[in-house]
């Protein structure tokens, strides 16, 4: 099984024990590590952070010790914006320039492949996204002719039904991608006005339409029905939780909220908590399991957080094995307890290790 793990370059800026550099990553934990994100400037793939080149080197040094590890560079992301991707992909010359710029950049910096994180192609971009993938793969095949190992090509795709329908020609893009990471999280957010888990495995009994689509099981099944081969589908598991501020004394699933939860001490983003911050939150909190959805949530005062723990990730891994998927994807290593100093077990990367162990279990 693949265990595809994202690392985010901005995690270096978190203060104190939240600061994570690639040299802190366990070289034997994942089969693939994806560095997020690269930029595109003047139609050429480019660095984003001032010290990306240093961090690329740090990440790719891990391969000296684990030659089986593959590293990919992810281009795009939320801050890059869909519009900029759209302009490049829809213009033949821009697209060609971008595609041509990728292999030398990856080779220079020691990466084994590219991950496309166009979040998200619009309805009019659907065909352009397919063309971009098809042409990128053709370039990778051509570039590898002189006996080089062919560069890998993957894409991170939304798990939301509406986005899947408007953005992706699943059957076509699957032919050209080495694997597809389906982002089976962020199904529920503060925009709903109520509490709910952002990464349930199954549909909950409390769920009403449109929530019958807002779960991992539906998204995976839908992707498979649309023609994604199970052998290429890698299922996303988050090492972060989504939090809410409760608006009343109700604390269950579907309770009214006044907005996102308060920012974490390290991640400093309202409505999001890293797993290591959740471990802190759990001290003195009340933990519940949403039985049908097979995921936990916790409450403390007026704060509510839905997250994954070692039990829920094992259920998710068993599910992906049952569906004969290619493996699991983790967003993100730097949101796990990477130092092993928060979650009371001392183990570094406890969630990702639980996923790895479950994948290896017979």
């Amino acid at each position: 099984y693949k265990l595809v793990c994202y690392y985010t370059s901005w995690s270096q800026y978190r203060e104190g024990d939240g600061s994570c550099f690639p040299d802190a990553l366990d070289r034997f934990l994942c089969t693939h590590i994806i560095y997020s994100f690269a930029n595109i400037s003047n139609d050429h793939i480019d660095t984003w952070e001032w010290n990306d080149v240093t961090l690329y080197g740090m990440l790719n040094t891990l391969k000296n010790r684990n030659p089986n590890l593959k590293t990919l560079l992810s281009v795009g992301g939320w801050n890059f914006g869909s519009q900029r991707f759209s302009k490049i992909a829809s213009n033949t010359q821009s697209r060609r320039t971008f595609i041509k710029s990728v292999p030398p950049f990856l080779r220079t910096h020691g990466f084994d492949g590219l991950d496309l994180a166009w979040l998200y192609p619009g309805r009019r971009d659907k065909q352009h996204f397919t063309t971009l993938i098809k042409e990128m793969k053709a370039e990778f095949i051509k570039e590898a002719q002189p006996g080089k190992k062919q560069l890998l090509l993957s894409a991170a795709l939304s798990a939301g039904k509406v986005t899947i329908d408007s953005s992706y020609d699943i059957a076509k893009i699957s032919q050209h991608l080495d694997f597809i990471s389906i982002m089976t999280y962020d199904f529920h957010g503060a925009w709903r006005g109520t509490t709910g888990h952002h990464s349930p495995l199954f549909r909950g009994q409390e769920d009403a339409s449109p929530d019958r689509f807002s779960n991992t099981d539906y998204a995976v099944g839908y992707m498979l029905r649309l023609g994604a081969p199970a052998s290429k589908l890698v299922m996303g598991i988050p090492t972060f939780g989504r939090s809410f501020t409760l608006a009343s004394s109700e604390t269950g699933v579907g309770a009214p909220i006044s907005g996102p939860g308060i920012p974490g001490r390290f991640t400093k983003e309202a409505g999001t908590l890293a797993y290591y911050e959740i471990c802190d939150f759990l001290r003195g909190a009340t933990v519940h399991r949403i039985l049908g959805q097979q995921v936990p949530y916790a409450t403390k005062g007026n704060q509510w957080v839905g997250y994954d723990d070692q039990e829920s990730v094992k259920s998710k891994v068993q599910y992906l094995k049952d569906r004969q998927l290619a493996g699991a994807m983790v967003w993100a290593l730097d949101l796990d307890d990477f130092q092993g100093s928060f979650c009371g077990q001392d183990l570094r990367f406890p969630l990702t290790n639980a996923i790895k162990d479950a994948l290896a279990a017979t």
Partner: antibody, heavy 118, light 106 residues
Amino acid sequence: DVQLQESGPDLVKPSQSLSLTCTVTGYSITSGYSWHWIRQFPGNKLEWMGYIHYSGTTNYNPSLKSRISITRDTSKNQFFLQLNSVTTEDTATYSCARNYGYDEFAYWGQGTLVTVSA
Amino acid sequence: QIVLTQSPAIMSASPGEKVTMTCSASSSVSYMHWYQQKSGTSPKRWIYDTSKLASGVPARFSGSGSGTSYSLTISSMEAEDAATYYCQQWSSNPPTFGSGTKLEIK
């Protein structure tokens, strides 16, 4: 090749602070890796104390967290250990070290014996 | 924290003899590192990532193991191998060392 050299007092009184310097040659402490302090007690037991990362962030052994501070002077390519409120139990040979992978210690100084005694 | 128990604490071997020492972890670890220390000097990295020999380490040394059980083996003891050997992990925080196996030459 990188070399590390510890220096500091060899005798410290109980309740005082122990301060040691590690001078690094052959590699800039701001260029990469983590820079560690490890001590070896008279019975030969080894204990990792903490590190300062090239980025400046620190990580300490939880058993010492309330007493330890590791800092650096990048202009002199040195990093420092301060251990407060020492007792005779802190008598040990103190070594500075640099990692190779995140999790093991590839280069060590020769160590300096610090005795805590009245 | 993870406790590493090394056995035996002290052992002796004749030149040419095969030597095996073990390191048992109180919880599962991903891989183990080993150090050699001779009297009056700092430990030297000897074996890393369970089985890889550090630069300059003779091929008669080998390492193996997984989970909670690891070992260091010398296929044919030589006088220069007399030293104390420590195992070390950092799968869990903080990193910890074993109490050491002192290997003497007969």
